[in-house]
């Protein structure tokens, strides 16, 4: 298991929410990506392929997510101060072999300007 800080901008703020970007290498064909808040699984997305190369995408812990060919974005809404924490992208690579797990993360700072419904 490889642990480290994300070497890219992991948090993108917009409209009182945050997009958490979890990247993976272009070569990865099948994987599970979990978003962890501290040690708790918040969201996950699994991409697999069958024997006819048909793609299956599953979420056991559903969040609004977006898949591209090298990243999974998870979206959290209605930000408040309780969202401030360490967030980790836990990537399990199934294909290509060998099976590998990587963990990258960063701290989500919440500032007043990023909250959805500020009191004036």
């Amino acid at each position: 298991e490889i642990n480290g800080s994300a070497n890219y901008e992991m948090f993108i703020f917009h409209n009182g929410g945050v997009q958490i970007l979890c990247k993976y290498p272009d070569i990865v064909q099948q994987f599970k990506m979990q978003l962890l808040k501290g040690g708790q699984i918040l969201c996950d997305l699994t991409k697999t392929k069958g024997s006819g190369n048909t793609v299956s995408i599953k979420s056991l812990k559903f969040c609004h997510s977006q898949l591209s060919n090298n990243s999974v974005s998870f979206f959290l809404y209605n930000l408040d101060h309780s969202h401030a924490n360490y967030y980790f992208c836990n990537l399990s690579i199934f294909d290509p072999p060998p099976f590998k797990v990587t963990l990258t993360g960063g701290y989500l700072h919440i500032y007043e300007s990023q909250l959805c419904c500020q009191l004036k």
Epitope: I27, S51, G52, N53, S56
Partner: antibody, heavy 117, light 111 residues
Framework: EVQLVESGGGLVQPGGSLRLSCAAS????????MDWVRQAPGKGLEWVSN????????EYSPFVKGRFTISRDNSKNTLYLQMNSLRAEDTAVYYC??????????WGQGTLVTVSS | DIVMTQSPDSLAVSAGERVTINCKSS??????????LTWYQQKPGQPPKLLIF???TRQTGVPDRFSGSGSGTDFTLTISSLQAEDVAVYYC?????????FGQGTKLEIK
């Protein structure tokens, strides 16, 4: 150790039906696509059908589409193949196989289906 | 559907000799950096066994006398030094698209 055990084969008349089962153990069944592959006596391998991890996607060979239905019960770790309108050319050993992400990495011993009057 | 054609249909080789089995697909099996081509071995009375995936990657536990090569439409399974226990039928298989198909098989015997 991965184990796949097929059952339900037998002799059936043309036009008849059979339901095959495959009991899986030794791995997390709900994490894998599963397939049926058949082999006519003295012949080569022929893919029949597959199903994704939760049963929401199923694909079929053109030779069996509309007659066969694949399904799974993840609570029972069991794969099924419902075969209707059976023909003589469906006579074969039917293998249950785990699709291990990029190949059929585990196979059962097979169950023989004979379609004859 | 992609058609997989193996050659030869059968061969008899002396123990210790090198064996080459060919497989040709009717269209390219290359996607990105992967060839979606697999080799299986089936001994009499047994289910098939996975030997090689992605054209050239040996499955864990498979002896290193087995190797796979090729790309696109032309692939080869090589046994560097034939052993008595290698008597079997060998199948190539693609999973490039649906339906996945197998070659007709190559029967390997000891001379």
């Amino acid at each position: 150790e991965v184990q796949l055990v097929e059952s339900g084969g037998g002799l059936v008349q043309p036009g008849g039906s059979l339901r095959l089962s495959c009991a899986a153990s030794g791995f997390t069944f709900s994490d894998y696509w599963m397939d049926w592959v058949r082999q006519a006596p003295g012949k080569g391998l022929e893919w029949v059908s597959n199903i994704d991890e939760d049963g929401s996607i199923a694909e079929y060979s053109p030779f069996v589409k509309g007659r066969f239905t694949i399904s799974r019960d993840n609570s029972k770790n069991t794969l099924y193949l419902q075969m209707n309108s059976l023909r003589a050319e469906d006579t074969a050993v039917y293998y249950c196989s785990r699709w291990g992400r990029f190949a059929f990495d585990s196979w059962g011993q097979g169950t023989l289906v004979t379609v004859s009057s | 559907d992609i058609v997989m054609t193996q050659s030869p249909d059968s061969l008899a080789v002396s123990a210790g000799e090198r064996v080459t089995i060919n497989c040709k697909s009717s269209q390219s099996l290359l996607s990105g950096s992967f060839n979606y081509l697999t080799w299986y071995q089936q001994k009499p009375g047994q289910p098939p066994k996975l030997l090689i995936f992605y054209a050239s990657t040996r499955q864990t536990g498979v002896p290193d006398r087995f190797s796979g090569s090729g790309s696109g439409t032309d692939f080869t399974l090589t046994i560097s030094s034939l052993q008595a226990e290698d008597v079997a039928v060998y199948y190539c298989h693609h999973h490039y698209n649906a339906p996945p198909t197998f070659g007709q098989g190559t029967k390997l015997e000891i001379k």
